[in-house]
């Protein structure tokens, strides 16, 4: 049976080092990588393997590596961000935008710069809702619809249809009826006066309460590791 080679060892022609090993170009040998949370304190030689040491506070390595120094964790999250992953020895801090904000400038993991979601003013409704990485797109309310709110979530809603119109609706105001009840109202039990800003149409998607935790889909997918950590030996 073939002997198991213990690091460091000289690789055969045409072969590469095994998983969790790297080829050290100085020693010309296959040597052990350091585990996540560690870095190479002493590089291998022909006769001694890599010596690994733990990352210091506020530094990390996410992959098996042979970097001489751990990577620095990113700076603390700003006031418009929430920390969705803490800085540990094995992972960088990840900051994502808090509700009502979107990422205007992303980085490999998380967000570098958050910006508040655009609010559509009265007469305009949300054409495309904001996402983690894109702003709200507003559009003017088409004839027969209105929005009387300044909101990053409200869409244009149809005017109520009156038997007798007291005040015609426009893009920023619902129609006002003179009859005791309109032929059709979009919100059951709605008063027949222009609705206050706080009133929501049932067609509008409810926004999460501030206490709602972001779902896993809110987190950006993990990007590739920094090149310094990448393996070239396997």
């Amino acid at each position: 049976p073939a002997q198991v080679a213990f690091t460091p060892y000289a690789p055969e022609p045409g072969s590469t080092c095994r998983l969790r090993e790297y080829y050290d170009q100085t020693a010309q040998m296959c040597c052990s990588k350091c585990s996540p949370g560690q870095h190479a304190a002493v590089f291998c030689t022909k006769t001694s393997d890599t010596v690994c040491d733990s990352c210091e506070d506020s530094t990390y390595t996410q992959l098996w590596n042979w970097v001489p120094e751990c990577l620095s964790c990113g700076s603390r999250c700003s006031s418009d961000q929430v920390e969705t992953q803490a800085c540990t020895r094995e992972q960088n801090r990840i900051c994502t935008c808090r509700p009502g904000w979107y990422c205007a400038l992303s980085k490999q993991e998380g967000c570098r710069l958050c910006a508040p979601l655009r609010k559509c003013r009265p007469g305009f409704g949300v054409a495309r809702p904001g996402t983690e990485t894109s702003d709200v797109v507003c559009k003017p309310c088409a004839p027969g619809t209105f929005s009387n709110t300044t909101s990053s979530t409200d869409i244009c809603r149809p005017h109520q249809i009156c038997n007798v119109v007291a005040i015609p609706g426009n893009a920023s105001m619902d129609a006002v009826c003179t009859s005791t009840s309109p032929t059709r109202s979009m919100a059951p039990g709605a008063v027949h006066l222009p609705q206050p800003v706080s009133t929501r149409s049932q067609h509008t998607q409810p926004t999460p309460e501030p206490s709602t935790a972001p779902s896993t889909s809110f987190l950006l997918p993990m990007g590739p590791s920094p090149p310094a950590e990448g393996s070239t030996g396997d």
Epitope: P8, Y9, A10, P11, P13, T16, Y23, Q25, T26, Q28, M29, K46, T47, T232, G233
Partner: antibody
Framework: QIQLVQSGPELKKPGETVKISCKAS????????MSWVKQAPGKGLKWMGW????????TYADDFKGRFAFSLETSASTAYLQINNLKNEDTATYFC????????WGQGTLVTVSA | DIVLTQSPASLAVSLGQRATISCRAS??????????MHWYQQKAGQSFKLLIY???NLESGIPARFSGSGSRTDFTLTINPVEADDVATYYC?????????FGGGTKLEIK
């Protein structure tokens, strides 16, 4: 298969500069270092040093410090040897050789320095 | 630096006979259970071809007529039987430590 293909012969005058290329194929370029070896007519083989293809850090043998420079174009899997201020004694064939304790060699580049 | 002394400088052997080339190092080239001594062939006007790596390992595609032996400071390349195509200069090289060093070469001719 592993191949190292070097640039063609060069005829230079003393004081000029020459840059020799060595293009690697058949393996991951950044895994193995690249050595350079000089073979002068009627003389032995001299190891000039090597360059770490992962970090780009060169190491020069004592006799080749100063006028000699190793460099890389990693995206093209190519290593370079540049010799500045050429002298007559630089007339030789220069070989690139993959640094994997044993060596795979380029075909060599003859540099002739003559007034 | 490790000095490699190769002998003989030239060698004339009849076809079908054995050729033996020696390489002596000024200090041991052994580390981690390996001897970092290698043998190359250079034909006239050509580059180097790896024959034997780490003292005794035959490189892929090299005929079994070539063999290597030795450890620490004394190494041997043997060609048996010699063929006409083997006319070349043979070099030993150590890579146990930098700088890499080479023997002075042995020129093999046919008698």
């Amino acid at each position: 298969q592993i191949q190292l293909v070097q640039s063609g012969p060069e005829l230079k005058k003393p004081g000029e500069t020459v840059k020799i290329s060595c293009k690697a194929s058949g393996y991951t370029f950044t895994t193995f270092g690249m050595s350079w070896v000089k073979q002068a007519p009627g003389k032995g083989l001299k190891w000039m040093g090597w360059i770490n293809t992962y970090s780009g850090v060169p190491t020069y043998a004592d006799d080749f410090k100063g006028r000699f420079a190793f460099s890389l174009e990693t995206s093209a899997s190519t290593a370079y040897l540049q010799i500045n201020n050429l002298k007559n004694e630089d007339t030789a064939t220069y070989f690139c050789a993959r640094r994997s304790n044993f060596a795979y060699w380029g075909q060599g580049t003859l540099v002739t320095v003559s007034a | 630096d490790i000095v490699l002394t190769q002998s003989p400088a030239s060698l004339a052997v009849s076809l079908g006979q054995r050729a033996t080339i020696s390489c002596r190092a000024s200090e041991s080239v052994d580390s981690s259970g390996n001897s970092f001594m290698h043998w190359y062939q250079q034909k006239a006007g050509q580059s180097f071809k790896l024959l034997i790596y780490r003292a005794s390992n035959l490189e892929s595609g090299i005929p079994a007529r070539f063999s290597g032996s030795g450890s620490r400071t004394d190494f041997t390349l043997t060609i048996n039987p010699v063929e006409a195509d083997d006319v070349a200069t043979y070099y030993c090289q150590q890579s146990n430590e930098d700088p890499w060093t080479f023997g002075g070469g042995t020129k093999l001719e046919i008698k």
